[in-house]
Each structure stands twice: as structure tokens, then as C-alpha cells.
Interface confidence: low
């Protein structure tokens, strides 16, 4: 055993090299100098090295450093990125940017792994919050990592960053996630004009309040069936006919085909069948002509 | 070990005001955000209000919205709960919750004792 | 806002039951939904989050299914334990709602 150990004759590793290929587990053990192998990290990636082999290696960086990996090494770890745990990377400090791509290459079409999601909080947290660099990379990466957030940590993204952020980045976001975003994205686009602010702002507005969309109203933007259908129902209902009108502009027919579905069918039930009449759409289950309406929220806020 | 700890309750007329605190301990208290939820004598449970661990985002139940007023203090592990123009449908327990994520999903998972709020003339 | 609808809102039941306990969302919440048990004079404890994920030191007993509006609590064998108040909350937007609650009666 004692011999097996040691490094066989002319066999001591130089440098990072294709021969090391046919160096048995225990060989790479015995001959390869981890401080050397730190230095030259950047070539493992270029040789075809077995699963058995990269454990060793990670075996010699993990006995080298037992505190973490200094980022010069992880920036080149490559595959061997892969074999490392949850646990290994929370002993990292990740800083650069660079650092990060060169990470997510490696895990590339790949759904996000916990390592990914540890590398990620780790880099995150080491920035202070989500700045718009970060969030171009991780979105590019994963277009669904900004709705993988809890609302908590969507709280630290500055509105700067929310241009970096494309509609599919937002497809599986809910409401809670976009209560918090659509502030942010509102102060990040306020300097737009009217039609550019509506295409920037439109994947936002299921967290947009009843006044937001009252004054989009008044904008001719067309709003779309799907992203009406998305909005708050607490934001819909107090829109009158005309308001809703207005903002749907030539997609207002689209709300026939909606009109068992929420947002529209608790819509409906809140406008005066009479209103409704005048769209022309045959909608059905608003408050007959002649009832009294009263306004709960008000008479509460009276009493 | 994660406690939580009400204090503030009582009597108060209605019309009156009154302010709650929560004292939080075994727990780093600035990365979590909070709520409260009250419970009426023999009634179920209400929600009433959130906070993010840097106060950045608020909400209130409709029920107590433009009466009541959530904050923290993170460097007293405290949360606060100021209630004015209280009624008589406000007395209830109040319960301080830390509010725990799983991925994106909210639940509470740790809760106080509670404090009573008897609001009567 | 979302309505939390429980049912039944009491039951009667002995030791060794099969109890369910059924929450309906008023609008779809995908699986953002807890369960809570709670014994007079306490505060509530968590037993089920993300609709059946158990919580860490709650006995196996206990188990959660559902997805979108319907959603199920069930306890495979009632022991005196168990006998209690129990919630379900949805946490997909506020204002977060509770369901009325289902008291655990003792038969």
C-alpha cells in the first residue's frame, strides 16, 4: 500500500497535460501536485478526463483548500464544476461576473441544478442585489430564474435592472412576484413615451392598481385579451365599461370569448347590464336596469 | 431556538389606538419578512398585514387598510403593529408570524403567543 | 380577493379514522396552499406547505394533495392528538386568505 502511494518513477506530473489520461486514480493521487494543478486548471477542461479522474482532482483542490476555492480557480474549474456539491460552493466567494457565465456555460440546456441555485445566491448575496449585469446573464441562462424569486428577494432588485428583463422572463411569475416587480419596472420606464412605455410596462401590469390602468385608459395603447386576462381581478373591477372600452380598443370583442372566465366574469357582474349593451357583444350577467347600486367599499369607509 | 413574543394588548374604547410589538429572537430577524394575523373570539383566522425584511413592501388587509400601520425596527428584532380608529370588529388575538419560503412559496411557520386587543366602551 | 372555502366545518370522528378535509380556492392558486392545526388557547401550527409538502416534525399521519382549486388534508389514522382546529391558507397573492377552519371533534 505504502508503495502503491508513492509516485512511480519518471511519472511526476510536470504539467496539466493529455498523458495524465493514462495515469491510473491512484497515479493522478501520487503525481500530480495540487498547487500545480491550481495553477493550470485552465487545461483540464481541454482533455478528456473520466468521471474516476475528476474526482481525484477535486479530491487534490479540496485538500489544498479546505476554506473554499480561491475564485482563480473556480473561474477555470469547468466541467469539474459539475462534481462539486451545494456544499463546496457555499465555501466560495464569487465576485466576478466573468466567474459566473463561465459557470453556467458548463451547465448549459440543463435545468437548474442545486449547485447552479447555490453558485447563484452565493454570487448574489456577495453583490448586495440583483443588478442588471447579473440579471441579463442569469436570464439569458434561465429565463425563468426571476420567477423562481420569492417576493422577498425580488424586493432587492433596484428598477434599473428591470430592463434587462424580457416578457418570457416574467411567464411564470404570479401575482404576489408582480405586485412587486410592476413598481419597479413603472419608475424604470417613466421616462418613456406613451407607446413605448406601454410595450416595455405590458408584461408588468398583473400588479398594476386600478388607477394605473385607468390612466392607461386614456392612452389608445389596445391591450391585448392575454394580458387583460392576466391583471388583478381587484384592479379590473372598479373600471367602468368605458374605461375597459378604451383600453382594450379593438380587442374589446375578445372579451365575448373571456366572458366566463375571471377576470371578465366578475367584471361583468359588477357593471350595469345596460353598459354592458352598449359594447355590442351580446355579454350577459350584469346588474338589470332599475336595481340600486351600492358601493360596500364606500358605505364601510363611511360607517 | 425561534421565539416570538406579542406584547402590547388590551383594553382600548373604540375610536382609540393602540400599538403592538413583536419581540423576535433566535433567528437572524432582518432576512425574514413578517406578518400579522388576528383572530376574533371564536372565529377563524385573518390575515392582516406583511412586511419585507428591508420594509421595502407592504400590505394590509382590506379590513384594516388606512387604520393600520406595519414597521420593523431591524436593529431591535422588533415588529410593530400601530392600529387607530379602532372598532369593535378589531378585537381580537394578534398573532406576530415569520413568514418561511420554500422556492417562492410563503407559509408560516413560526408564530407567538399572541396578544388580546379588547376593543369596547 | 381569494375565498378559501372548507369543508366540512365540523366532523365527529374516533381514534384510528380516516379523516379528510377538503379546501376549494375561488380561483386557480397552483399548489400555493398550507395547512394549519391549531388547539384552543395556542397559536397555530404548521403542518402542510406548497399543498403537500409535510412540514419537518409533523408525524406522517399527516399528508396533502391537490392542485389549481382543490385541494385535500388527510389524516390516515386519528389519534387524540389530532383532535383540533384545522386551516387552510392560500399564499398565491393577497391578501392571503385563510378558509373558515374545520373543528376535529372527538365522537
Known amino acids: 500500500e505504502v508503495e502503491k502511494t508513492a509516485c512511480p518513477s519518471g511519472k511526476k506530473a510536470r504539467e496539466i497535460d493529455e498523458s495524465l489520461i493514462f495515469y491510473k486514480k491512484w497515479e493522478l493521487e501520487a503525481c500530480v501536485d495540487a498547487a500545480l494543478l491550481a495553477t493550470q486548471m485552465d487545461r483540464v477542461n481541454a482533455i478528456p478526463f473520466t468521471y474516476e479522474q475528476l474526482d481525484v482532482l477535486k479530491h487534490k483542490l479540496d485538500e489544498l483548500y479546505p476554506q473554499g476555492y480561491p475564485e482563480s480557480v473556480i473561474q477555470h474549474l469547468g466541467y469539474l464544476f459539475l462534481k462539486m456539491s451545494p456544499e463546496d460552493i457555499r465555501k466560495w466567494n464569487v465576485t466576478s461576473l466573468e466567474t459566473l457565465k463561465a459557470l453556467l456555460e458548463v451547465n448549459k440546456g440543463h435545468e437548474m441544478s442545486p449547485q447552479v441555485a447555490t453558485l447563484i445566491d452565493r454570487f448574489v448575496k456577495g453583490r448586495g442585489q440583483l443588478d442588471k449585469d447579473t440579471l441579463d446573464t442569469l436570464t439569458a441562462f434561465y429565463p425563468g430564474y426571476l420567477c423562481s424569486l420569492s417576493p422577498e428577494e425580488l424586493s432587492s432588485v433596484p428598477p434599473s435592472s428591470i430592463w434587462a428583463v424580457r416578457p418570457q422572463d416574467l411567464d411564470t411569475c404570479d401575482p404576489r412576484q408582480l405586485d412587486v416587480l410592476y413598481p419597479k419596472a413603472r419608475l424604470a420606464f417613466q421616462n418613456m413615451n406613451g407607446s413605448e412605455y406601454f410595450v416595455k410596462i405590458q408584461s408588468f401590469l398583473g400588479g398594476a392598481p386600478t388607477e394605473d390602468l385607468k390612466a392607461l385608459s386614456q392612452q389608445n395603447v389596445s391591450m391585448d385579451l392575454a394580458t387583460f386576462m392576466k391583471l388583478r381581478t381587484d384592479a379590473v373591477l372598479p373600471l367602468t365599461v368605458a374605461e375597459v372600452q378604451k383600453l382594450l380598443g379593438p380587442h374589446v370583442e375578445g372579451l365575448k370569448a373571456e366572458e366566463r372566465h375571471r377576470p371578465v366574469r366578475d367584471w361583468i357582474l359588477r357593471q350595469r347590464q345596460d353598459d354592458l349593451d352598449t359594447l355590442g357583444l351580446g355579454l350577459q350577467g350584469g346588474i338589470p336596469n332599475g336595481y340600486l347600486v351600492l358601493d360596500l367599499s364606500m358605505q364601510e369607509a363611511l360607517s | 431556538e425561534v421565539q416570538l413574543v406579542e406584547s402590547g394588548g388590551g383594553l382600548v374604547q373604540p375610536g382609540g389606538s393602540l400599538r403592538l410589538s413583536c419581540a423576535a429572537s433566535?433567528?437572524?430577524?432582518?432576512?425574514?419578512?413578517m406578518n400579522w394575523v388576528r383572530q376574533a373570539p371564536g372565529k377563524g383566522l385573518e390575515w392582516v398585514s406583511y412586511?419585507?425584511?428591508?420594509?421595502?413592501?407592504?400590505y394590509y388587509a382590506d379590513s384594516v387598510k388606512g387604520r393600520f400601520t406595519i414597521s420593523r425596527d431591524n436593529a431591535k428584532n422588533s415588529l410593530y403593529l400601530q392600529m387607530n380608529s379602532l372598532r369593535a370588529e378589531d378585537t381580537a388575538v394578534y398573532y406576530c408570524?415569520?413568514?418561511?419560503?420554500?422556492?417562492?412559496?410563503?407559509?408560516?411557520?413560526?408564530w407567538g403567543q399572541g396578544t388580546l386587543v379588547t376593543v369596547s366602551s | 380577493d381569494i375565498q378559501m372555502t372548507q369543508s366540512p366545518s365540523s366532523l365527529s370522528a374516533s381514534v384510528g379514522d380516516r379523516v379528510t378535509i377538503t379546501c376549494r380556492a375561488s380561483?386557480?392558486?397552483?399548489?400555493?396552499l398550507n395547512w394549519y392545526q391549531q388547539k384552543p388557547g395556542k397559536a397555530p401550527k404548521l403542518l402542510i406547505y406548497a399543498a403537500s409538502s409535510l412540514q419537518s416534525g409533523v408525524p406522517s399521519r399527516f399528508s396533502g394533495s391537490g392542485s389549481g382549486t382543490d385541494f385535500t388534508l388527510t389524516i390516515s389514522s386519528l389519534q387524540p392528538e389530532d383532535f383540533a382546529t384545522y386551516y387552510c391558507q392560500q399564499s398565491y397573492s393577497t391578501p392571503l386568505t385563510f378558509g373558515g377552519g374545520t373543528k376535529v371533534e372527538i365522537k
Open positions: 408570524a415569520r413568514e418561511d419560503f420554500s422556492h417562492k412559496l410563503g407559509y408560516f411557520q413560526h
Open positions: 380561483q386557480s392558486i397552483s399548489s400555493y
Open positions: 433566535g433567528f437572524t430577524f432582518s432576512s425574514y419578512s
Open positions: 412586511i419585507s425584511s428591508s420594509s421595502s413592501t407592504i
